[in-house]
């Protein structure tokens, strides 16, 4: 807490300028008007104040806004935004997606901090969903952005807002997380040609469940051997060897190389050894002939 | 207010599937970000997850069971269910089902009076 | 799998006095999301589990204050103030970092 003291004469601040960067931490506080620094909160940025002169402004800004900055003193905030708590930005109610990229552009570059993600969380929660704009935003600053969300979070993604991600973009979400997302994506693509949609939902896929990529092998759609190694091992398993064919198409040749990894691995163990032999791969492991095959699928559809 | 309840038969032969089914009362089970969890816990001994499905039909198992284990879900019945086959005495216990998620993983928050189930000829 | 190792099996603890059931994982429990999905359950007696704690340090609802979880990695504690008579029977931790999903095998709080 700076101590109060009168204000030197002739040093009283008419604007926030340059010559600010002189004056010590109690001649801040005593000589700049709080409601002026307000309004000229954007000039604060160009002028390289130090650590300990910014939480002096900070200071200023809190006593003038005791229950939290408006919007107009918040997008301006430039790198005073970096002096924030969280417990400062839980106060705020940002609704522009102009003031959400101004403060994200100050810490670019950087991990999200406790700051930034309740800035986000502030955000968000103003507008009632994840919109496709301010995701497309979230994820240019913070390519794995979605995969930071709550299961709760990531079901209040409106399907519209699919369009937004890029692969890259699910790189490091949980398999639950593409759970959630998968059957948004379903929705959203659903009225894409065969081809088309294949190349929009191949990201998502990581959260298919069995019954679609049965589906899919009926479309010839050529999955590549990077996107089935991504597959849900429990979603692959109960594929058959002519259901795995047709879901590869030519990449089917790629299996031999990953027949040590998972899925692909699991796969094997599960299929009859002769249907794996028509593949002409040399793949090994399988069943052997003769031996009985519990089907659980079959003894599903039985009962 | 979500509640779980496990039906199924008490007594199941070995070899055979043993079958439960938990019904969700009070909530959708398409409601997303939800995950619909089947645990077990033998006699006198601690917890074993089973596996979980999501309303859209995507499962995860524990690999221990995998190749035994059929997790289904009816949205239309707002209910899911596990299938055990090829069961021995190992497989006797008190069988929970249980929702998981929300805001985090791992808060299991509400859980059914679970289903003793005893594998015995 | 990751292996949750729980101290000690039972813990006879004075009413009115605070109780620590402590919890080790095989490896560290920080998610790629950065947060840590460790859970506390408790089961009475004849009942299904409750949920208490998640994410290490989050009480549920209506869960009583006097119970608070904390820890980091691989070293995790769940501290109960003052116990009462309502919360003997048997604490898990769980871990939901990794799947398969995981528990400790239990630590019994009875009153002496």
């Known amino acids: 807490e700076v101590e109060k003291t009168a204000c030197p004469s002739g040093k009283k601040a008419r604007e926030i300028d340059e010559s600010l960067i002189f004056y010590k931490k109690w001649e801040l506080e005593a000589c700049v008007d709080a409601a002026l620094l307000a309004t000229q909160m954007d000039r604060v940025n160009a002028i390289p104040f130090t650590y300990e002169q910014l939480d002096v402004l900070k200071h200023k800004l809190d006593e003038l806004y005791p229950q939290g900055y408006p919007e107009s003193v918040i997008q301006h905030l430039g790198y005073l935004f970096l002096k924030m708590s969280p417990e400062d930005i839980r106060k705020w109610n940002v609704t522009s997606l102009e003031t959400l990229k101004a403060l994200l552009e100050v810490n670019k570059g950087h991990e999200m901090s406790p700051q930034v993600a309740t800035l986000i969380d502030r955000f968000v929660k103003g507008r009632g969903q994840l919109d496709k704009d301010t995701l497309d935003t979230l994820t240019a600053f913070y390519p794995g952005y979605l995969c930071s969300l709550s299961p709760e979070e990531l079901s209040s993604v409106p399907p519209s807002s699919i369009w937004a991600v890029r692969p890259q973009d699910l790189d490091t979400c949980d398999p639950r997380q593409l759970d959630v997302l998968y059957p948004k994506a379903r929705l959203a693509f659903q009225n894409m040609n065969g081809s088309e949609y294949f190349v929009k939902i191949q990201s998502f896929l990581g959260g298919a469940p069995t019954e679609d990529l049965k589906a899919l092998s009926q479309q010839n759609v050529s999955m590549d051997l990077a996107t089935f190694m991504k597959l849900r091992t429990d979603a692959v398993l109960p594929l058959t060897v002519a259901e795995v064919q047709k879901l590869l198409g030519p990449h089917v040749e790629g299996l031999k190389a990953e027949e040590r990894h998972r899925p692909v691995r699991d796969w094997i163990l599960r299929q009859r050894q002769d249907d794996l032999d028509t593949l002409g791969l040399g793949l090994q492991g399988g069943i052997p002939n003769g031996y009985l095959v519990l089907d659980l699928s079959m003894q599903e559809a039985l009962s | 207010q979500v509640q779980l309840q496990e039906s199924g038969p008490g007594l199941v032969k070995p070899s055979q599937t043993l079958s439960l089914t938990c019904t969700v009362s009070g909530g959708s089970i398409s409601s997303g970000g939800y995950y619909w969890n089947w645990i077990r816990q033998h006699p006198g001994k601690g917890l074993e997850w089973i596996g979980y499905?999501?309303?859209?039909?995507?499962?995860y198992y524990n690999p221990s069971l995998r190749g035994r284990l059929i997790i289904s879900v009816d949205t239309s019945k707002n209910q899911f269910s596990l299938r055990l086959s090829s069961v021995t005495a190992a497989d006797t216990a008190v069988y929970y089902c249980?929702?998981?998620?929300?805001?985090?993983?791992?808060?299991?928050?509400?859980w059914g009076q679970g289903t003793t189930v005893t594998v015995s000829s | 799998d990751i292996v949750m190792t729980q101290t000690p099996l039972s813990s006879p603890v004075t009413l009115g006095q605070p109780a620590s059931i402590s919890c080790r994982s095989s490896?560290?429990?920080?998610?790629?999301?950065?947060?840590?999905?460790l859970s506390w359950l408790q089961q009475r007696p004849g009942q299904p589990p409750r949920l208490l704690i998640y994410k290490i340090s989050n009480r549920f609802s209506g869960v009583p204050d006097r119970f608070s979880g904390s820890g980091a990695g691989t070293d995790f504690t769940l501290k109960i103030s003052r116990v009462e008579a309502e919360d003997v029977g048997v604490y898990y931790c769980?871990?939901?970092?990794?799947?398969?999903?995981?528990f400790g095998g239990g630590t019994k709080v009875e009153i002496k």
């Open positions: 490896q560290s429990l920080v998610h790629s999301d950065r947060n840590t999905y």
């Open positions: 499905i999501y309303y859209s039909g995507s499962t």
């Open positions: 249980a929702r998981d998620g929300g805001d985090s993983y791992g808060r299991m928050d509400v």
């Open positions: 769980m871990q939901a970092t990794q799947f398969p999903l995981t």
